[in-house]
Each structure stands twice: as structure tokens, then as C-alpha cells.
């Protein structure tokens, strides 16, 4: 006869490990008992359980409620046991010793490998600002057994570097992603991808990049000279800029207060029916937490009753 078993049994932390041991013998042979033991290089051989053909399953008190036989139907020649709720400390070598008659005893050893799936965490780096040099965008850490693989999935150009720390029963891997911040990266996903044999599929954590910037300001609305004549309605100036965080807009008039009736609505300056009083230099002030920008325009409102005057529109930033 011979024993059918496995060299390595792999199980995920918390799952039940089936330790296989099947005696394949002649029809007239019987199994008296199967003794299971943990083989430890320091502590020697320690019995886990004994499956007795007549008196049933005996379990070492140290493994009480953790060792069971597989559910029925059971073959009398099957000495396999289930080790419930595998923990890291269960990892190691096991021995099954099958006592048969009349053939005698057979033994086999196997290794139990307990996979500890990682629970990754992603930590964003310091605030990103356009104009910085190479900067940490995010770091991702995952600890498991065996060591997990940590990579990055992104369209953003950057560099990644990894380091690992080995502990007695696991390894922690940290990967950092560095980049040179630019406004084009704003809102782009940066995904940490963790692979491990104990995971059915990769674990992914996505961080959305936020790059602080403030674009140059410009003013639109002076393109059509005909709009800037006395009596015209609906004339507006719109301040153009963009930024992260979104900027705030402020309108002022360089040569005095804003004329009465002129309304400020965010980035837009709305005029009442135009008069020559509305002529002047207007300044759009754009700011966010990162920076501020100004753009100024000169508005001259033409009186059509005064044919000696031409519309003179000057824009300056």
C-alpha cells in the first residue's frame, strides 16, 4: 500500500485547510488509526489529532474545536482532517502516520502554507502645485504573506519606487509614485494595484490627483465695438481664467469706484444701458489659495451723437 497526500497545502488566512492523507492498499487491508502531528524544528513532533477506526476522532486540547474530519460520506481509508480557521501560526510541516493491518505503518509529510492577503492603504503625498519639481504624489503600502506586489496604474507620467520590510511572518511593501505636477494632471486617476496569491483579483485603490494652479487672466467682451455705444444694453465683460482650487473673481475700476448700476456676478461684469460714465479702466483680479492674477481693460463708450469720436478699445494685461 501507499499514502496519497500533497507536498504542499495552500490555504488563505481564516479558511479551513484540508490536510489530505489517503491510504491506498489491497482490499484485505484495514486502517487501524491515523495520527496527525505538527513537526516543528524547535519543539519536535506534537500530536494534533488521532483518527481511530473504532473510537473516532481524538483531538489534542491545544487544537480543540479546530480539527474535524471532512463531512460524510467518508472512506474508511481516508485519514484526511480539516484544520478550521487557519492562522499564520499554523504554517509549517505536518505528518500523517497511518497504522494498518496487516501491512504496518506508513507516514507522509506535507507543508501547510497560509496565505495572508494584504489590506492595502493609499496615502496621498503633500499638496501638489504646478511649478514644483519632482514631488511625491502618493504612497501605497500592503502587508501580507508572502510579500505582495504593489504597482501603479495611471496615464500620468511619473516614477515609482518600492521598498519592503520583512517581518517574522509577513512582509510589508511600500511603493511611492513621484511626478512633476502640471495642470494637465488635475483630476487624473492614480491607481495603486496590489497583487497577491491570496487574492482572487487584484486590489485597486484610486486616488484622484489634485494639482493646484492658476492660469493667466484675460477679459473678453470688447470684441464687438458696436456694443459699446451709449444706450446699448446687455454689455458684459467676462474674466477668463481657470485654476485649482477654483478661483474667486473680483472686479474693480482703476480710476474710481464701479459706476452705479454695474453688477458683479462672479467672473462677469454686467452693465446697465451704457453712458459715457461707463468709460474707464476695469481690472479683473483672480485668486485662489495658490496665487493671484490681474487683467485690465480700457473701455471707451462712444456717443453716436458725437460723430467726431471713434470707438477706441484698448486691452492690456
Amino acid at each position: 500500500g501507499e499514502l496519497e497526500t500533497s507536498d504542499v497545502v495552500t490555504v488563505v488566512l481564516g479558511q479551513d485547510a484540508k490536510l489530505p492523507c489517503f491510504y491506498r492498499g489491497d482490499p484485505d487491508e484495514q486502517v487501524g488509526q491515523v495520527a496527525w502531528a505538527r513537526v516543528d524544528p524547535n519543539e519536535g513532533i506534537r500530536e494534533l489529532a488521532l483518527l481511530h477506526s473504532k473510537y473516532g476522532l481524538h483531538v489534542n486540547p491545544a487544537y480543540e474545536d479546530r480539527v474535524e474530519q471532512p463531512p460524510p460520506p467518508r472512506d474508511p481509508l481516508d485519514g484526511s482532517v480539516l484544520l478550521r480557521n487557519a492562522v499564520q501560526a499554523d504554517e509549517g510541516e505536518y505528518e500523517c502516520r497511518v497504522s494498518t493491518f496487516p501491512a504496518g505503518s506508513f507516514q507522509a509529510r506535507m507543508r501547510l502554507r497560509v496565505l495572508v492577503p494584504p489590506l492595502p492603504s493609499l496615502n496621498p503625498g503633500p499638496p501638489l502645485e504646478e511649478g514644483q519639481g519632482l514631488t511625491l504624489a502618493a504612497s501605497c503600502t500592503a502587508e501580507g504573506s508572502p510579500a505582495p506586489s504593489v504597482t501603479w496604474d495611471t496615464e500620468v507620467k511619473g516614477t515609482q519606487s518600492s521598498r519592503s520590510f520583512t517581518h517574522p511572518r509577513s512582509a510589508a511593501v511600500t511603493s511611492e509614485f513621484h511626478l512633476v505636477p502640471s495642470r494637465s494632471m488635475n483630476g487624473q486617476p492614480l491607481t495603486c494595484v496590489v497583487s497577491h496569491p491570496g487574492l482572487l483579483q487584484d486590489r485597486r485603490i484610486t486616488h484622484t490627483l489634485q494639482v493646484a494652479f492658476l492660469a493667466e487672466a484675460s477679459v473678453r467682451g470688447l470684441e464687438d465695438q458696436n456694443l459699446w455705444q451709449v444706450g446699448r444694453e446687455g454689455a458684459t465683460l467676462k474674466c477668463l481664467s481657470e485654476g485649482q482650487p477654483p478661483p474667486k473673481y473680483n472686479w474693480t475700476r482703476l480710476d474710481g469706484p464701479l459706476p452705479s448700476g454695474v453688477r458683479v456676478k462672479g467672473d462677469t461684469l454686467g452693465f446697465p444701458p451704457l453712458t459715457t460714465e461707463h468709460s474707464g479702466v476695469y481690472v479683473c483680479h483672480v485668486s485662489n489659495e495658490l496665487s493671484s492674477r490681474d487683467s485690465q481693460v480700457t473701455v471707451e463708450v462712444l456717443d453716436p451723437e458725437d460723430p467726431g469720436k471713434q470707438v477706441d478699445l484698448v486691452s492690456a494685461s
Epitope: 495520527a35 502531528a37 500530536e47 481511530h52 473510537y55 486540547p61 497504522s99
Partner: nanobody
């Protein structure tokens, strides 16, 4: 041949404790399981608990959590600590040894009476 000698029986009130001991001599190298059986009047002899040379144990459902078997392989002894005793535990308790040649209990002690009064 294996000889088994028990000690420690007696009368105890319900809820009390008793400790039974059993010493083996003779052909002890052939012993595999050691255990305790009991037989109440007009009832079948039943296996209460047994223990392997490596310390693996099995208990009858009726005594789980109340009885504890221990074995000293070097001294060839097996003890049974009985706590929270009940009147239905009243019986003659037998120490038994199983030969690893036969895989059944074939050596028996003379028995010791345990009586639990209510």
C-alpha cells in the same frame, strides 16, 4: 499482558468533584489509547473518554466540559478529573487500555464505584 489498577472512587454530592487515577504495568509498550468506561446498573458499558499517547482526547457528549482526561506516558498513568458531577454520572468506572496490535480496548481494570447523590 497489561495490568490496570484504578483508585479514587467514592460518594460525592451533586455538583461536587472527584478524581480517578489508573496505573498501568506489564506490557505497557504495546498500549495505544487509554480510556475510561462506565457502566450504570442495567445499562450498557459506555466509553466516557479516551486519550492517545500524543495527548489527543475524545469525550462523550454527556461529559464534555465537565470531565478532563490526562495521561502521563512516562509514568504509565491516566487520570480522570470529574467536575460538576450529576446523579446520572453514578456508575462503576473502568480504566481500559487498547493494544496497538488490535485497535480495541482489551485490558481492563477492576472498576471503581462513583456514586453521586442529589
Amino acid at each position: 499482558e497489561v495490568q490496570l489498577v484504578e483508585s479514587g472512587g467514592g460518594l460525592v454530592q451533586a455538583g461536587g468533584s472527584l478524581r480517578l487515577s489508573c496505573a498501568a504495568s506489564g506490557s505497557i509498550s504495546s498500549i495505544n489509547l487509554m480510556g475510561w468506561f462506565r457502566q450504570a446498573p442495567a445499562k450498557q458499558r459506555e466509553l466516557v473518554t479516551s486519550i492517545s499517547p500524543g495527548g489527543s482526547v475524545r469525550y462523550a457528549d454527556s461529559v464534555k466540559g465537565r470531565f478532563t482526561i490526562s495521561r502521563d506516558v512516562a509514568k504509565n498513568t491516566v487520570d480522570l478529573q470529574m467536575n460538576s458531577l450529576k446523579p446520572e454520572d453514578t456508575a462503576v468506572y473502568y480504566c481500559a487500555a487498547e493494544s496497538e496490535r488490535t485497535y480495541y480496548f482489551d485490558s481492563w481494570g477492576q472498576g471503581t464505584q462513583v456514586t453521586v447523590s442529589s
